[in-house]
Interface confidence: medium
Amino acid sequence: MASSGMADSANHLPFFFGNITREEAEDYLVQGGMSDGLYLLRQSRNYLGGFALSVAHGRKAHHYTIERELNGTYAIAGGRTHASPADLCHYHSQESDGLVCLLKKPFNRPQGVQPKTGPFEDLKENLIREYVKQTWNLQGQALEQAIISQKPQLEKLIATTAHEKMPWFHGKISREESEQIVLIGSKTNGKFLIRARDNNGSYALCLLHEGKVLHYRIDKDKTGKLSIPEGKKFDTLWQLVEHYSYKADGLLRVLTVPCQKIGTQGNVNFGGRPQLPGSHPATWSAGGIISRIKSYSFPKPGHRKSSPAQGNRQESTVSFNPYEPELAPWAADKGPQREALPMDTEVYESPYADPEEIRPKEVYLDRKLLTLEDKELGSGNFGTVKKGYYQMKKVVKTVAVKILKNEANDPALKDELLAEANVMQQLDNPYIVRMIGICEAESWMLVMEMAELGPLNKYLQQNRHVKDKNIIELVHQVSMGMKYLEESNFVHRDLAARNVLLVTQHYAKISDFGLSKALRADENYYKAQTHGKWPVKWYAPECINYYKFSSKSDVWSFGVLMWEAFSYGQKPYRGMKGSEVTAMLEKGERMGCPAGCPREMYDLMNLCWTYDVENRPGFAAVELRLRNYYYDVVN
C-alpha cells in the first residue's frame, strides 16, 4: 500500500516505479538494455509498506523482496537493516551482500511516467472518511481532527480490513453455502469468493473451474502473513486477490470474476437478508478489483447484530465481518482487536455533542448533581483535583473537579473567573480538556473532563517503555489542541507536560488553559512559587522580560514540553535557577537533545525556541511539521 509514509520514503526516487507487477518490471529492465547491475525499485504487492528490488544479471531479472520491519527499517530477508529504501540501494551499490551482483545503474522512470499507485490508493481517502464517519458517528471538525490525528492507524486499519468491504468477501459462511453461491448465475471460469474459516484468521478461496468449485485454504502464519499452502505470502487479503488476478501462481487458473456478495450489485452493502443475485455479477475491470467499489457501509461498534452461541455460530445472513466480537466499553481493545483510538473514548467529543444533552446557558452547575470521591487525584498551582460524577440529562459523566484554593474566593476574582470560565466553556476540541462548568459551593469548583492516566510528565517518568513513535503521536495531538486554541485566539500561558493529561497512552489533552490569567497569576504569583517550580523555565523571553503572552509564547513553551516528553518527564534546565536560565537563553544557548530523541524533533524544539517572536513559527506551522514527521515515522 503506497501510504503517505511509504510514498515519502520512495516516491522521490527516480528509479521507483510504484505498484507495477514483476512482469512490468522485467519489461522496463529489457527496455533499459538488461545490462548487469541495472535495477529499479517497485512497491511490494504482497507486503504492506514493503518494496521489491528488480535487478538485471546474466540477461535475466532477479527480484528481491524488501520488507518493512516493525521498527520502520527496511531489509531484504536475511540481510542487514537500512533506514530507507534509498539507503538499502546505496549500500548494495557497494556491497552485493547476498544479491546476485552489485547495483550499478538505476533504471529511471521514462519522462512523464509517475510511480503507479496501487488499486487501493484511490479508494483509501474515501474509505477512511466513511469508516470514521460511520464507526464513530463523527462529522465536521471532530471528523477532520480524527482523520488528521489518527491517519496512520486508520490507513493500517483500512488496509487490513478492506477485504470486508469487497464484493468477493463473504464472511463466515460454510463450505456448502460458498459452493451454492459460486454456482448461482454465470459459470465463468475463474469466478471466485473468499470466506472466513475460523476466528484465528484462516480463510478459504473458492474458485470455479470447469463447473467445479475448488477450495484453497488461506492460512495466517505467526507473523500475520497470509498464503495458500506453499504459496507467496501477503499482508492482506486484497493484496492476495490482486496478485492471483493477474497470475495463477499455483492456482488452477487466475481469478477473473468476483462472486458478488449476495444482495449487492456493484456497491457493497453489508446488511439485510440475502437476495438471490442476478446472473450478471460485477466484471473484473482493468482498474483492478478494488477500484470498482463505490460505496461502503460500516456497522457501528457495539451495535448488536445478533447473539448466536459463542464458538458455534451459524450464519444465515451475510453481514459485515460476521464473527466480529461484541466488546464491552471497558474493554474496547479486547479480543483480536485493534488498539483503542482516541475516538473510542468517552471524551473525544463534547458531552453536548448528543443533541439531547442541552448545553446549559449558564456556566454554573447545580452542586446537587455533582458527587465527589474522597481521595485526591492530585494538586497543582491552583488547588486540588478530585474525581467526581456529574449527573447530566441522559448520562452520569465521570469528571475531574478542580477545587480552587481559598484565595480564588476573593470577590474581586469572581468576575474575572466567571468571564474566563464562560470562554473556556465554549472551547471544544478533542485535544483539550473541556470544561463542563463551575460550581460555587464549599469552594470554587471547576468541573472538567476526566483523563484517567494523569499528567504526561509523571506518566512518562513511570513508563519508560513508551516508544518515541508514541511520544511523537502525543506531542502531535498537543500541537493540534494548541493550533485550535491559537485559532480561537486563546492563550494558554502555562503550557507544560504537567498540564497535558493522558486519557490513554495514545490520547493526550491539554488542561489548565487560561487559569493563570483567570486567577491573576501575575509575576508576584510566580515569584511566590517554591524554588525550582517556577514556570519561568517554560516561558519565552518576552514573557519573562515584558510579561507579553501570546500564542507565539505558547509555542516556546511547547518546545519545552516536547523536550520534557522526549526526556521521559525530566525537569527542564535541571538544577538551574530562573535567572540562570534567562542568562543562558540570552546567550543563545538552548537545552541539549534528549537521549534517543529523533533529530527532526530536536530541530523542531529549537525552532520553537526562536528568540525573536516574529520569526518564531505559529502552531499551524508546528502542527503541520509534526504531522508530516509523525505520518512518516508511523508508516
Epitope: 484465528n200 448488536r304 447473539s307 459463542q310 466499553p329 479486547k334 479480543g335 483480536p336 482487536q337
Partner: antibody
Framework: EVQLLESGGGLVQPGGSLRLSCAAS????????MSWVRQAPGKGLEWVSG????????YYADSVKGRFTISRDNSKNTLYLQMNSLRAEDTAVYYC????????????WGQGTLVTVSS | DIQMTQSPSSLSASVGDRVTITCRAS??????LNWYQQKPGKAPKLLIY???SLQSGVPSRFSGSGSGTDFTLTISSLQPEDFATYYC????????FGQGTKLEIK
Amino acid sequence: EVQLLESGGGLVQPGGSLRLSCAASGFTFSSYAMSWVRQAPGKGLEWVSGISSGYYYTYYADSVKGRFTISRDNSKNTLYLQMNSLRAEDTAVYYCARVGWYWNGLDYWGQGTLVTVSS
Amino acid sequence: DIQMTQSPSSLSASVGDRVTITCRASQSISSYLNWYQQKPGKAPKLLIYAASSLQSGVPSRFSGSGSGTDFTLTISSLQPEDFATYYCQQSSVLPTFGQGTKLEIK
C-alpha cells in the same frame, strides 16, 4: 483443547511479594484479552485485573491498584500477576481466565492456585 | 463500581424443578451480563454471555434474559449435576460479580 495452568502460589508473609504465572495453550493466546479472578476461602468471586490482547492495556480492581501488576508475554503464551505489599485479605485461590470475544464473558478458566498471606 | 446483587443467596430445589435466579445491577449495564456455574473445588464455568446467549456446549435447559438493570437465569428442569453455586458478572465497566446463589438439593 484450550488449557490454562496457573502456578506460583504459596505461603507469604504480609508485606511480601509473589508472582503468579498462567501458561496458556490450545488457542491463539495473542488474540485474547486475559483476566485474573480470585476467590477467598468460602467467599465469592472477585475480579482482580485484566490485560488486553496486543497492546497491553491494563485494568485493576480498586482493592489491588498500585500493589498488583498484570503483564503478559505473547511469545511465551504466558500471563503474569506480580503481587506486592501483600495483605491477609489477599489470601485466595487465584484463577486466570480468558476473556471471550463476545461481550467479555470469561469463557475458559484455569484450575486456580492458592495464595496464603499469613505471618 | 457497579454493584451486582443476586437473589436469593441460597435456594433448595428438587430434580425436575424449574429454578430462577435474579441479578440486579446498581446501574444500567445494557446486555453486558454473564452467568457462571461453580462446583466445590472447581473453577467457574461460563453458562450465558450477553445476558441471553448460551455458551457453546451448555445444555439448552439453561437460559438467560433481561437487560438494563434486571436479569434472570432460568434452569427449566433441574438435573442432578446442576446443584452448584451460580454467579452473575457485569462487564459493562470493570467487571464485578454478584455474591453468588447456592443451589442445593431439597
